[in-house]
Amino acid sequence: QEDEDGDYEELVLALRSEEDGLAEAPEHGTTATFHRCAKDPWRLPGTYVVVLKEETHLSQSERTARRLQAQAARRGYLTKILHVFHGLLPGFLVKMSGDLLELALKLPHVDYIEEDSSVFAQSIPWNLERITPPRYRADEYQPPDGGSLVEVYLLDTSIQSDHREIEGRVMVTDFENVPEEDGTRFHRQASKCDSHGTHLAGVVSGRDAGVAKGASMRSLRVLNCQGKGTVSGTLIGLEFIRKSQLVQPVGPLVVLLPLAGGYSRVLNAACQRLARAGVVLVTAAGNFRDDACLYSPASAPEVITVGATNAQDQPVTLGTLGTNFGRCVDLFAPGEDIIGASSDCSTCFVSQSGTSQAAAHVAGIAAMMLSAEPELTLAELRQRLIHFSAKDVINEAWFPEDQRVLTPNLVAALPPSTHGAGWQLFCRTVWSAHSGPTRMATAVARCAPDEELLSCSSFSRSGKRRGERMEAQGGKLVCRAHNAFGGEGVYAIARCCLLPQANCSVHTAPPAEASMGTRVHCHQQGHVLTGCSSHWEVEDLGTHKPPVLRPRGQPNQCVGHREASIHASCCHAPGLECKVKEHGIPAPQEQVTVACEEGWTLTGCSALPGTSHVLGAYAVDNTCVVRSRDVSTTGSTSEGAVTAVAICCRSRHLAQASQELQ
């Protein structure tokens, strides 16, 4: 934003002469911390988001801002309060010298402070064909429901609202918060300024080339004519949406964020608050051919993060870069050469590429699903998007080797029918961040608030791990994996499911003294086994002969190595039934898999025995995958023998409820 007065020069001069300022929180016993973008060129020193503690009222926020200003003034610094946040996060946006950070971190109510940073647009007619189920033809694409009950908010550049594709479908709000364009001779040509937003609005709801032709849209301008915005501008935009939602509650809301910046704690926090208020947020994974977890809002767990694929289901390459990947991506969607509205004229079309276009596809699909089932929660919508995706069609060789296992092999698709999916037990796999290599390092994977953690497994590329366990944290179960001495680190893998009225608990058996191994079962009446985990304190779990096998007729039992503690996830839910399915291979093999049959959903995935040459187990869609060390490094064949154990469940209750609806 341009200053309308000359007072700011003094502060700018102060900033030019200062060093980088504070990288960490000051050592004065304060709990408040300072954060800034890891990507130096994207930093915007001199503007800071001061985030206050959760229960802080607006009046306290204003008072804290004024106290900071008063203290700064006495130290000879002029400051500006650019915005006071309330509605999503309490806090304020302040223009000040970095010299004042230490002072600001000591203010009452301050939780953390984040330096502002830049965000960028993520763009560089097979697309409808890919997301359309086989029973439709793309050239006569008539979606079952055009998303008419849903409002889609687009946070992007300005748009050409009179374009024939989107005319009457997009309401341009009066919201605008954009930085000045770079360079003194930049010409703000309307068609250039509107390019990105117009195209995306067309992809979501365009008359001819839109996914959800019936969806109505509202646009907020947070990106300038160069496709550049700020974290703070995006925050204020999200707050605007929340306030609009409170003033005039409408039907389901989808927010499309086709932009990305460096990892931002505050932007992720704002997305989390908005998502918990019932808003579905869809964002671009980013076009940096990098781990999406290093970017925001892509790294926010509550946001549906979308990577880009092309007509051949290859990850999209964009110049020297391409789509982002990794565990923070929920799914992929068409994002190369996407035909959509061009701002060059009111009837022009153009093709654009990028994860912005991919996110727009998913926003359109989400609008249609929500229009058909307006009561869907975010968790239910995400699970459905995953369930109806095309599976295992992406060539994973494009991704870095260490990211392949973490990246979902899913391409978004419309459900064959927007109704009648209710009977399905939906589950998804959630990977934790990497634990790091220290001896006692752990990694934690969490499910969304209204999902149930039905099982927990772990994985380590080196094989040096100490298993995993389910434990309570803040009233919810989480999955924690443990690294071992000399290990390069572990991942925790949670299996997160939608199980209404579930009552789940964890039963643990300590390491057995006896040679037959450790066992634990679900002993409560009506509880069924949904997952098994094992955790051990010894550094190297030796081979256990004879191999541990589950006794026949005892499906509700977890078994494991005698030196490990075994944890059983036991759940009671109306009509829930589960069965154990095993696939053992006597000869050493790098990968053993076992899948659940049609109509059953994989809830648990583990390996038998849990010896040290097993790298770990994880679920990929409805298949349990157990990975072992390279066969050439494995000793005897008996040591190499591995069994993949899948627990497959279904809910008769959900099936009945679904039949009653039809």
């Epitope: 007065d5 007072d7 204003e62 106290r67 008063a70 003034a73 500006k80 650019l82 000591k106």
Partner: antibody
Framework: EVQLQESGPGLVKPSQSLSLTCSVT?????????WSWIRRFPGNTMEWMGD???????NYNPSLKSRVSITRDTSKNQFFLQLNSVTTGDTATYYC?????WGQGTLVTVSS | DVVLTQTPVFLSVTLGDQTSISCRSS???????????LEWYLQKPGQSPQLLIY???NRFSGVPDRFIGSGSGTDFTLKISRVEPEDLGVYYC?????????FGSGTKLEIK
């Protein structure tokens, strides 16, 4: 540099209202701070009368609360003081301030 | 309201001498953030007040180091180590911790 300048009548009759304007240059009053009115009586005693924040919220000295009002005009970058039912005891030099900075002050005499 | 009792009321000092002014508060001026918002202002003849010391002991930009603030809780002192001709005027202590903001009654410094 932020500068503040008070203006208004130097003479007010008892029981009437005293109205002063503070014009601010070099800074937008909606961009921050508390914008205060302070007075200095003939015997050198100082009294903080109240302030208006950048967001428009006001805070008054309880001893004057029933008589004082502070408002602003953001388009002109000005804020105002109104003191009702004045008596000779309200004779003072009135300052507008963005502490720690002060205006030059204006002397207001209450006399019939 | 917080009452600031300032002593002495008048001070007559020889140039080059050291002098001090006391300010006692009716309640602690330490705020919840750990800071104590006690300030000292000087009003020179014909001028508006100017800040000398903030947060008990910090000198404002451009203030000579002969001005020294000290104290804590409820007892505060302003020391002038070598009085110079430009130091004459009225000195006020001021608290910004509690509403309403209040000033001491002032100390008039004269040169002998």
């Amino acid at each position: 540099e932020v500068q503040l300048q008070e203006s208004g009548p130097g003479l007010v009759k008892p029981s009437q209202s005293l109205s002063l304007t503070c014009s601010v240059t070099g800074y937008t009053i909606t961009s921050g701070y508390d914008w205060s009115w302070i007075r200095r009586f003939p015997g050198n005693t100082m009294e903080w009368m109240g302030d208006i924040s950048y967001s428009g919220s006001t805070n008054y000295n309880p001893s004057l609360k029933s008589r004082v009002s502070i408002t602003r005009d953001t388009s002109k970058n000005q804020f105002f003081l109104q003191l009702n039912s004045v008596t000779t005891g309200d004779t003072a030099t009135y300052y507008c301030a963005k502490l720690p900075g002060w205006g030059q002050g204006t002397l207001v005499t209450v006399s019939s | 309201d917080v009452v600031l009792t300032q002593t002495p009321v008048f001070l007559s000092v020889t140039l080059g001498d050291q002098t001090s002014i006391s300010c006692r508060s009716s309640q602690s001026l330490e705020y919840s953030d750990g800071y104590t918002y006690l300030e000292w202002y000087l009003q020179k003849p014909g001028q508006s007040p100017q800040l000398l010391i903030y947060e008990v002991s910090n000198r404002f930009s451009g203030v000579p180091d002969r001005f020294i603030g000290s104290g804590s809780g409820t007892d505060f002192t302003l020391k002038i180590s070598r009085v110079e001709p430009e130091d004459l005027g009225v000195y006020y202590c001021f608290q910004g911790t509690h509403d309403p903001l209040t000033f001491g009654s002032g100390t008039k410094l004269e040169i002998k």
